[in-house]
């Protein structure tokens, strides 16, 4: 059988300064068992930018609604872009364990920010 | 119509060993976690273990003595219990781990449940 | 481990009454909290998950809520088939997942 992959449909996504970009982020099973959590950049210097169980992300919302069963939509909307907000992110599965572990990231979405329009 | 049937239950001397299965129907078994939950003779219910894919999880009062696997293929779940012992007497239920939102698990559907009985 | 401890244990009440269950765990489990009832000689049925939605083909009378450490499972109005056994469960921090003790509903 196929193993679990994490889909990011959009290679890059262009918002203008001030509006919302989306962020997609699908996978095709429900196991292995663990959470999916999003990051800017990649590598060890990377930036947490969602995690649902631990943290403050104010600017962050789950698309999928929170009570919906058996999800496998983990997109997420960052809202009131700012140019600081560019760069590429991934949506990352985490294998449960003490602690978890990665187990596969999406290819990544590179979020380029436009001015705002006058 | 989801269906979970567990069979391999019995009565077995302490230090003896079982395997349990469990048939699964009516859902994609390969993509969810299953588990089994245990629940002593006039008691409370009690997790025992989980699998996701080839991830395992264990209560600490069955680590190093009880192993879960799965053959996605016959859609079927087992748990081999060796060193058994008279505190592991139980009905023993295969359940189905559901998720919501981006947190889980939970169990939304159960087998009727096979007996151990540990006894000598 | 988390801990969930349930309240009253044993429950007497009579058809048509309003029964209120309480389960408290002993750390924030936010509002992943699930409620089952377990009928004799049968097994566990779910009946909320994430402390308030009610599962597939579940009367409206059955309603969950809380959030943190403290959930209610209420039945609006009781009907016989509702007697048993309910735990409740946790499944923020596992694990291990872990069951509250059960409050058993017996007729008054």
């Known amino acids: 059988e196929e193993e679990l992959q994490v889909i990011q449909p959009d290679k890059s996504v262009s918002v203008a300064a001030g509006e919302s970009a989306i962020l997609h982020c699908t996978v095709t099973s429900l196991i292995p068992v663990g959470p999916i959590q999003w990051f800017r950049g990649a590598g060890p210097a990377r930036e947490l930018i969602y995690n649902q169980k631990e943290g403050h992300f104010p600017r962050v919302t789950t698309v999928s609604e929170s009570t919906k069963r058996e999800n496998m939509d983990f997109s997420i909307s960052i809202s009131n872009i700012t140019p600081a907000d560019a760069g590429t992110y991934y949506c990352v599965k985490f294998r449960k364990g003490s602690p978890d572990t990665e187990f596969k990231s999406g290819a990544g979405t590179e979020l380029s920010v436009r001015a705002k329009p006058s | 119509e989801v269906q979970l049937v567990e069979s391999g239950g019995g009565v077995v001397q302490p230090g003896g060993s079982l395997r349990l299965s469990c048939a699964a129907s009516?859902?994609?078994?390969?993509?969810?976690?299953m588990s089994w939950v245990r629940q002593a003779p006039g008691k409370g219910l009690e997790w025992v273990s989980t699998?996701?894919?080839?991830?395992?999880y264990y209560a600490d009062s069955v680590k190093g003595r009880f192993t879960i696997s799965r053959d996605n293929s016959k859609n079927t779940l087992y748990l081999q219990m060796n060193s058994l012992r008279a505190e592991d007497t139980a009905v023993y239920y295969c359940?189905?781990?559901?998720?919501?939102?981006?947190?889980?698990?939970?169990?939304?559907?159960w087998g009727q449940g096979t007996l151990v009985t540990v006894s000598s | 481990e988390i801990v969930l401890t349930q309240s009253p244990a044993t429950l007497s009440v009579s058809p048509g009454e309003r029964v209120t269950f309480s389960c408290r765990a002993s750390?924030?489990?936010?509002?992943?909290i699930a409620w089952y009832q377990q009928k004799p000689g049968q097994a566990p049925r779910l009946l909320i998950y994430a402390a308030s939605s009610r599962d597939t083909g579940i009367p409206d009378r059955f309603s969950g809520s809380g959030s943190g450490t403290d959930f209610t499972l209420t039945i609006s109005s009781l009907q016989s088939e509702d007697f048993g056994v309910y735990y409740c469960?946790?499944?923020?921090?596992?694990?291990?997942?872990?069951f509250g003790g059960g409050t058993k509903v017996e007729i008054k």
């Open positions: 009516g859902f994609s078994f390969s993509i969810y976690a």
């Open positions: 359940a189905k781990d559901s998720t919501v939102g981006w947190s889980g698990d939970f169990f939304d559907y």
């Open positions: 469960q946790q499944y923020y921090d596992w694990p291990p997942f872990t």
């Open positions: 750390q924030n489990v936010r509002s992943d």
């Open positions: 699998i996701g894919a080839d991830d395992t």
